[in-house]
Interface confidence: low
């Protein structure tokens, strides 16, 4: 008697990794026999189709090998023209083993930037994603996060971040590993010691120790009242990325001498600065002209702008200067909160230097100006606009009296660094090369008032690093 | 990773002196600004005291000026407050926290855990 | 000596908005302040969220923010979360012939 199909198999969910075989049945019990197609995704298969065997009168449908692109629904529908057709669906999910379709490369960084090493994976399941640091897995931390990517990204690279990585991806299948990559992070000179100011008789020999440390390890030059030191024996250590000089002095006159390290990275430098004043004890008779005296800046508020231990002049018109001039920055720096990214690091280098000037130890103490050039510079090309409100509040007596020493210098009146380049201060922080400050942008399409001169690049390739600018 | 062990505390009579120590790992230490702040049982935070980077000047809560110092060993990689003349009202949870920058004034970005110290008869 | 002002409790419901502030018993915060804020789960350390008015220390969610609203510094918590539920803390400093940094006495933040 004839009989109206029926599937007594109904279709079930097939699990299969790329390049194997998979198998549907669709077993159907029907009188005549019946036609059974086949669908994926509502789409029919073609018997000739050559991925596909179809066998058993059409109730074996074989995948013969699976690729990513065969997840979806199958169907298979069967139709003897007794009854109405019966159909049965069942999902294939293809799966696969982890695999590392963009692994990490080696990176070199400059400690306390970001740092990402990419590890983007594929597979189903979804692989995890896990890194080893050397031969431990690496702990996450406030710092130190894998993205969603499989990415690693290391916020604020310390020294101790530097090693070797691979990413690991994992999932039910199986594990993949990068190949192992390496982190170098590099790091700004700094000094650890710094020389120390001595007062000594006439003819005595003297010896400034200097420590530096830095990755590369860096170099260190000795300076001589603004020259290349042009006597005296240098002697030098290396020691765990230690770097110690010893300069040995006879000396015979005073003098300011700086300590400085220079370490480079790629084509940039990165240079640290300490100072020592070398007095002669009978030289030092107070006069009673002095209004004030060298000290080294032991500040807060400057720290960041003027160089580590900076030799400078404090004023003794005032009862407590290290404090009185500190509370003028203090007060000062909070006005530049609101100015502009570009302005407010040369500001504050301007302020800081005007404020806590560099100081010429001698026998009588002198402060060293800043160069109008470098004035100008912050005045007509970093500063454009708020200059203009400054020195309007200033006109208009809008800064309390106590702010006095604030009213932005006057450019013009301050020594030019080319009749005497000794007879005033830089701003490192502006120590561009030339290249780079014509490309900076100013900050009005005004032509500035007075021409500014290009100002001197310390070498071709050098520049000075500017610290974190922030109050905190 | 970025770590500040305090240790130090314990049981003092009044009158007494005790020294805390706040080991640093994970940062450059000498060049931060340094705190300790304390917490009274079941109070609010209190800060005691703080130090700049290079240790040149150093500043405390009027309450505890002349009794409590405070010191840093930039080589060692710690702080110190040595507390003498202790008081019933000193008894606290030390914190040891770094500030965000060089300064004695910036904000604790980072603290220990604490170390508890009691002063009691 | 100055004291710093917060509202002892405030409660939010999840997904809510809700502002502490930090005031002075004498004078207004300004920026001159650098308000900081901190926050404090039982148990646990106090943790870093805002610095100078309104910079959030690194990891800290964008739901929170600081400025100066008035005389008073504020932290607003946007889209509050359970884990939120904490006492906050603000952090003033103070120069008025020596240099200080003042707690507020904190708020107790409840999320419902």
């Known amino acids: 008697l004839p009989k109206a199909p029926v599937i007594t198999t109904p279709l079930e969910t097939v699990d299969a990794l790329v390049e194997e075989v998979a198998t549907f049945m669709c077993a159907v019990e029907s009188y005549p026999q019946p036609e059974i197609s086949w669908t994926r995704n509502k789409i029919l298969i073609k018997l000739f189709d050559t991925r596909y065997s179809i066998r058993e009168n059409g109730q074996l449908l074989t995948i013969l090998s699976v690729e990513d692109s065969d997840d979806g629904i199958y169907c298979c529908t069967a139709n003897n023209g007794v009854g109405g057709a019966v159909e049965s669906c069942g999902a294939l999910q293809v799966k696969m083993k982890p695999k590392i379709t963009r692994p990490p490369i080696n990176v070199k960084i400059i400690e306390g930037l970001k740092a990402v090493l990419p590890c983007t994976t594929m597979g189903n399941p979804k692989p995890s994603v896990s890194w080893i640091k050397g031969d431990s897995p690496l702990r996450e931390n406030s710092r130190i996060a894998v993205l969603e990517s499989g990415s690693l990204r290391i916020h604020n690279v310390q020294k101790e971040d530097a090693g070797q990585y691979r990413c690991v991806a994992k999932n039910s299948l199986g594990t993949a590993y990068s190949k192992v990559v390496k982190l170098e992070v590099e790091v700004f000179a700094r000094i650890l010691r710094a020389p120390e100011s001595h007062n000594v008789t006439f003819g005595s020999f003297v010896t400034l120790h200097c420590t530096a440390t830095g990755i590369p390890v860096p170099t260190i030059t000795w300076i001589e009242n603004g020259n290349a030191v042009s006597s005296g024996s240098i002697q030098e250590s290396v020691k765990d990325r230690v770097i110690d000089s010893r300069l040995q002095l006879f000396i015979t006159k005073p003098g300011l001498y700086t300590c400085i390290a220079t370490n480079k990275h790629g084509e940039k430098f990165s240079t640290a600065k300490a100072a020592a004043t070398i007095s002669i004890a009978e030289w030092s008779k107070p006069q009673k002209d002095n209004k004030g005296y060298c000290a080294q800046y032991r500040g807060e508020v400057c720290n960041a702008v003027l160089a580590k231990d900076a030799l400078v002049f404090l004023n003794t018109s005032y009862a407590d200067p290290e404090e009185a001039q500190e509370l003028l920055v203090h007060t000062a720096w909070n006005e530049l909160k609101v100015v502009s990214p570009v302005c407010r690091p040369a500001a504050e280098a301007l302020l800081c230097n005007h404020i806590f000037q560099e100081c010429s130890p001698g026998v009588v103490p002198t402060p060293i100006p800043i160069c109008r050039e470098y004035c100008l510079a912050v005045k007509e090309l970093f500063c454009a606009k708020e200059w203009l409100v400054m020195e309007e509040k200033t006109h208009r007596g809008l800064y309390r009296s106590e702010m006095h020493l604030l009213s932005v210098p006057e450019c013009s009146k301050l020594p030019s660094m080319h009749w005497d380049p000794t007879a005033c201060a830089r701003l490192p922080h502006l120590d561009y090369n030339k290249e780079n400050l014509k490309t900076f942008p100013p900050m009005t399409s005004s032509k500035p008032s007075v021409d500014i001169p290009n100002l001197p690049s310390s070498s071709s390739s050098s520049f000075s690093v500017s610290p974190t600018y922030s109050m905190t | 990773e970025l770590q500040l062990v305090e240790s130090g505390g314990g049981l003092v009579q009044p009158g007494g002196s005790l020294r805390l120590s706040c080991a640093a790992s994970?940062?450059?230490?000498?060049?931060?600004?340094m705190s300790w702040v304390r917490q009274a049982p079941g109070k609010g935070l209190e800060w005691v005291s703080a130090i700049p980077w290079n240790g040149g000047s150093t500043y405390y809560k009027e309450s505890v000026k002349g009794r409590f110092t405070i010191s840093r060993d930039n080589a060692k990689k710690t702080l110190y407050l040595q507390m003498n003349s202790l008081k019933s009202e000193d008894t606290a949870v030390y914190y040891c926290?770094?500030?965000?920058?060089?300064?004695?004034?910036?904000?604790?970005?980072?603290w220990g855990q604490g170390t508890l110290v009691t002063v009691s008869s | 000596q100055a004291v710093v002002t917060q509202e002892p409790s405030l409660s939010v419901s999840p997904g809510g908005t809700v502002t502490l502030t930090c005031g002075l018993s004498s004078g207004s915060v300004t920026s001159s302040n650098y308000p900081d804020w901190y926050q404090q789960t039982p148990g646990q350390a106090p943790r870093g969220l805002i610095y100078s008015t309104d910079s959030r220390h690194s990891g800290v969610p964008s739901r929170f923010s600081g400025s100066i609203s008035g005389n008073k510094a504020a932290l607003t918590i946007t889209g509050a979360q359970s884990e939120d539920e904490a006492d906050y803390y603000c952090?003033?400093?103070?120069?008025?012939?020596?240099?200080?940094?003042?707690f507020g006495g904190g708020t107790k933040l409840t999320v419902l």
């Open positions: 994970g940062f450059t230490f000498d060049d931060y600004g």
């Open positions: 952090g003033l400093y103070m120069y008025s012939g020596s240099k200080n940094y003042v």
């Open positions: 926290a770094k500030r965000s920058g060089r300064i004695a004034f910036g904000a604790l970005d980072a």
